[in-house]
Each structure stands twice: as structure tokens, then as C-alpha cells.
């Protein structure tokens, strides 16, 4: 996250953090039920371990935290990299988490943002994309939701309606590290960190989100039948 | 499989400009990002730069900064570096090179290295 | 910008022999770390990326390992074709840049 702030703990008990190797984190997730995240499709590796309930960017253990491995990771059918269509991913738990005020998941929103909704993204990404600076602790920021004109005439040719921008003005946006993880408007999850240019937070070149909305059907039965 | 195949080998005289190219047959640039790798003789590898085709952003070394260019035609797949004021000490082997760009514009943090190369294009530079 | 130092410059070894080389970077790169085997005249090749992972098709006896400044790169049991000049490479910011190289030479 470029030019956010520390979250306050406990505030956003629904972020996991993708982690390679003992503590390499690469992606954010979203807690969606006791036994589900969701991710970015890009997100997938062969072998991970999931995070949850933790503040610190530290490998450093705090008393809130869970510790998971995917046992199943099912990507959108329609997302094909290098594209960015369809850029969602579930992911199951090898067990549930135990409830508490560190871990908790967030309900998925099914009516689609509008424009000027402002929300909320959250990660452990870089907080500079030409230095690779990484945050001590889990980084928030307000953005708004942009209109889909606004959105494809920044990038042209490439948005479509699994997609939304959000952003603020120059200078804040989300960044590498932050993918597939939470843009929370009113409490409810709308979107996952997808892409954006690069370097991050330049003007007009908005961050760009999973629409949610567009998956609550797939989420479920997916879901359901796993 | 992708293969990238550069321009031939090239003499250019002190404070001309030179411009190699780098097609990828078999396949597209799409999803990777190009850099420019060159190495003198009997010396290492240096990085000069790269570029995004998919955006043409390019970012360089500040050693060349000033003197090169990187630029993409991704409707042709090919990748261009330009290197200009030679001199002497630019005699070398410029190699194209491609890497993912996983990681760059989708925002995940991971990094690939540099898995298929051009067969190297050598100049010479002599007065 | 992020300097690499490798060492040994070169190595004498015989097939068989187990061969290690190291790089340490001037700061941490995480895991943003990729190997190369360069022979006369030819292009490099890549066959680890992000430390220790292996690029497809590259055997088994290579292997890498490290994490933030200190990677080593190990050939379990040298074999004839492995007699190259072998580079690491930051990849965790720009610019990127190699090590100095290491020969690896027939004793």
C-alpha cells in the first residue's frame, strides 16, 4: 500500500497474508467463511501457507495469529494469465479457524459498488514499488470507487465488468504484495487487489479490483460442492 | 516454444548509435517484460535495462541512463535497444533476455528470473 | 543500487565432486534471486529462480538456497556438461544486477 497508514490492530480480522517458504509473503487473501479465503487467481503457487490474525509484517509470533495450509485451491474457470479477467481464487482450509477478534471473516457484498462509495484496502505490499519498501505492520487506505468510463479511459481496451478501479488522488494506490487482498466498502468485501500500472500510485492510473459482486453465485456453489 | 532472434552483428565507428532488435517467433510478449544484458569480452554480465511492452514503460541502469533507449512493438513482438555516443568500451555482446512480469503490473510480490534469451548480437565499436 | 559478490571467482573441481558457490548481496533481496550456467559463445541459461526454485528442464543436481543477502547455488555431482562460468542475479529492485561470476574449471 502506497502512502496508507497502520491499520489499527484487530481492525481488519478478515486479512490473511500468502506466505512461500517460512515467512515469504507474495499475496494477501480474504477470510470469507471458517474454512474459505478468497485470493486473486494470479495468486496460485503449488505450495503456500496461509496467515491469519497477525499485525506485524515479522515473522515475529503474536498471540492472535492462526497458521493454515490450502488444501484446495480452485481458481475462477474463466481467469487465463496473463489476463486480468475473472482474477479471483478460493482457497480451503486445511481447518476451520477458531473464532476470535483477530480472525473473523467478512461477508461478501452482492450489489456492485457504485461510484464515489469510498472503502477501504488493506496489505503487507511494498510501499514503493521502485525500492521494494515493506511496511512494518498491516497498512489501510480509504479509496474511492471510480466510474467505469473513468476506469476504461484509463486503461483503455483492458477493463471489463469483472473489474472495477478505485483510487484516490496521485500518489496513493495499492501495490505489489497487496494482491488478493480485501477492498472492504461499508463493512461488506467488494473487491480483491488485482493490478494496476507499474510503478504504482501514478496519477490516472488507478488501482484495479476483482468485482465481487459479479462471483457471489460461483463463490457459493463452489463452496458448497467442495 | 519461444525463441527471441536478434539483428546481426554490427561495426560502428566512436559517437554513432546503434540499434539492436529482438523478435520473439513462436510466440508474443504478452505478460513478460524484455531486458537488455550486455557483456564485454572476457567480462560479466551487466544489466542495462527493460521495458513493459504491454505499456512501453522501460526502466534503465543510471550507467546508461542518458545514452540508451528501449522500446517495444508488441504488435510485432519485437523489442528494440538503442545505444547511442559509442565508445570503445561499448564493444560487447548485447543480449535480449525475457522475464515475467508476474509480479510487476498484477500486484502479487514474486519474482522469475530471466528464462529465454536472444542468441546475442555482437558490436564492435572501432575507429 | 544493490551489489552482488560472488564467490569463489573460480573453482577447480572433477566430475563428481560436489560444487558450491555463494553470493551475498550489499542489502536483503528476500528470496529475489535467480542462477545462471553461461558457456563460450553462448547465452546464459537460467536455472534457479527465486533462490531455490528450479527452471523447468534444468536437472536435479542443481540446487539453491538462501534468504535477504546470502544465497549458495550447489551441484551435488558435477558432470562434464556442468563445466561453465555460473552468475547470480538480483532481482528484487532496479536496476538488477549479476555477480562477477564463477568458473567452474576441469582440475
Known amino acids: 500500500i502506497v502512502n496508507g497508514s497502520d491499520c489499527q490492530k484487530d481492525a481488519q480480522p478478515w486479512q490473511g497474508a500468502l506466505l512461500l517458504g517460512p515467512n515469504k509473503l507474495y499475496c494477501g487473501a480474504v477470510l470469507i467463511s471458517p474454512q474459505w479465503l478468497l485470493t486473486a487467481a494470479h495468486c496460485r503457487k503449488p505450495v503456500f501457507r496461509i496467515r491469519l490474525g497477525h499485525h506485524s509484517m515479522s515473522p515475529v509470533y503474536e498471540s492472535g495469529q492462526q497458521m493454515f495450509q490450502g488444501i484446495k485451491s480452485i481458481p475462477h474457470p474463466g481467469y487465463s494469465h496473463p489476463g486480468h479477467s475473472n482474477d479471483l481464487m478460493l482457497i480451503k482450509m486445511n481447518r476451520k479457524i477458531r473464532d476470535s477478534h483477530s480472525v473473523k471473516p467478512v461477508e461478501i457484498a452482492c450489489d456492485c459498488a457504485t461510484e464515489g462509495t469510498r472503502c477501504m484496502v488493506s496489505g503487507w505490499g511494498t510501499t514503493s514499488s521502485s525500492h521494494n519498501n515493506f511496511p512494518k505492520v498491516l497498512q489501510c487506505l480509504n479509496i474511492t470507487v471510480l466510474s467505469e468510463e473513468r476506469c476504461k479511459n484509463s486503461y483503455p481496451g483492458q477493463i471489463d465488468k469483472t473489474m472495477f478501479c478505485a483510487g484516490d488522488e496521485e500518489g496513493r494506490d495499492s501495490c505489489q504484495g497487496d494482491s488478493g487482498g480485501p477492498v472492504v466498502c461499508n463493512g461488506k468485501l467488494q473487491g480483491l487487489v488485482s493490478w494496476g500500472d507499474f510503478p504504482c500510485a501514478q496519477r490516472n492510473r488507478p488501482g484495479v479490483y476483482t468485482n465481487l459482486c459479479e462471483f457471489v453465485k460461483w463463490i457459493k456453489d463452489t463452496m458448497n460442492s467442495n | 516454444q519461444v525463441q527471441l532472434v536478434q539483428s546481426g552483428a554490427e561495426v560502428k565507428k566512436p559517437g554513432s548509435s546503434v540499434k539492436v532488435s529482438c523478435k520473439a517467433s513462436g510466440g508474443t510478449f504478452s505478460g513478460y517484460s524484455i531486458s537488455w544484458v550486455r557483456q564485454a569480452p572476457g567480462q560479466g554480465l551487466e544489466w542495462m535495462g527493460l521495458?513493459?511492452?504491454?505499456?512501453?514503460?522501460?526502466n534503465y541502469a543510471q550507467k546508461f541512463q542518458g545514452r540508451v533507449t528501449i522500446t517495444a512493438d508488441e504488435s510485432t513482438s519485437t523489442a528494440y535497444m538503442e545505444l547511442s555516443s559509442l565508445r570503445s568500451e561499448d564493444t560487447a555482446v548485447y543480449y535480449c533476455?525475457?522475464?515475467?512480469?508476474?509480479?510487476?503490473?498484477?500486484?502479487?510480490?514474486?519474482?522469475?528470473?530471466?528464462?529465454?534469451w536472444g542468441q546475442g548480437t555482437t558490436v564492435t565499436v572501432s575507429s | 543500487d544493490i551489489q552482488m559478490t560472488q564467490s569463489p571467482s573460480s573453482v577447480s573441481a572433477s566430475v563428481g565432486d560436489r560444487v558450491t558457490i555463494t553470493c551475498r548481496a550489499s542489502q536483503g533481496i528476500s528470496s529475489w534471486l535467480a542462477w545462471y550456467q553461461q558457456k563460450p559463445g553462448k547465452a546464459p541459461k537460467l536455472l534457479i529462480y527465486?533462490?531455490?526454485s528450479l527452471q523447468s528442464g534444468v536437472p536435479s543436481r542443481f540446487s539453491g538456497s538462501g534468504s535477504g543477502t546470502d544465497f549458495t547455488l550447489t551441484i551435488s555431482s558435477l558432470q562434464p556438461e556442468d563445466f561453465a562460468t555460473y552468475y547470480c542475479?538480483?532481482?528484487?529492485?532496479?536496476?538488477?544486477?549479476f555477480g562477477g561470476g564463477t568458473k567452474v574449471e576441469i582440475k
Open positions: 521495458i513493459f511492452p504491454i505499456s512501453g514503460t522501460a
Open positions: 542475479q538480483q532481482v528484487s529492485s532496479f536496476p538488477y544486477t
Open positions: 527465486a533462490a531455490s
Open positions: 533476455a525475457r522475464q515475467s512480469a508476474s509480479g510487476y503490473y498484477d500486484r502479487s510480490y514474486y519474482r522469475y528470473g530471466m528464462d529465454v
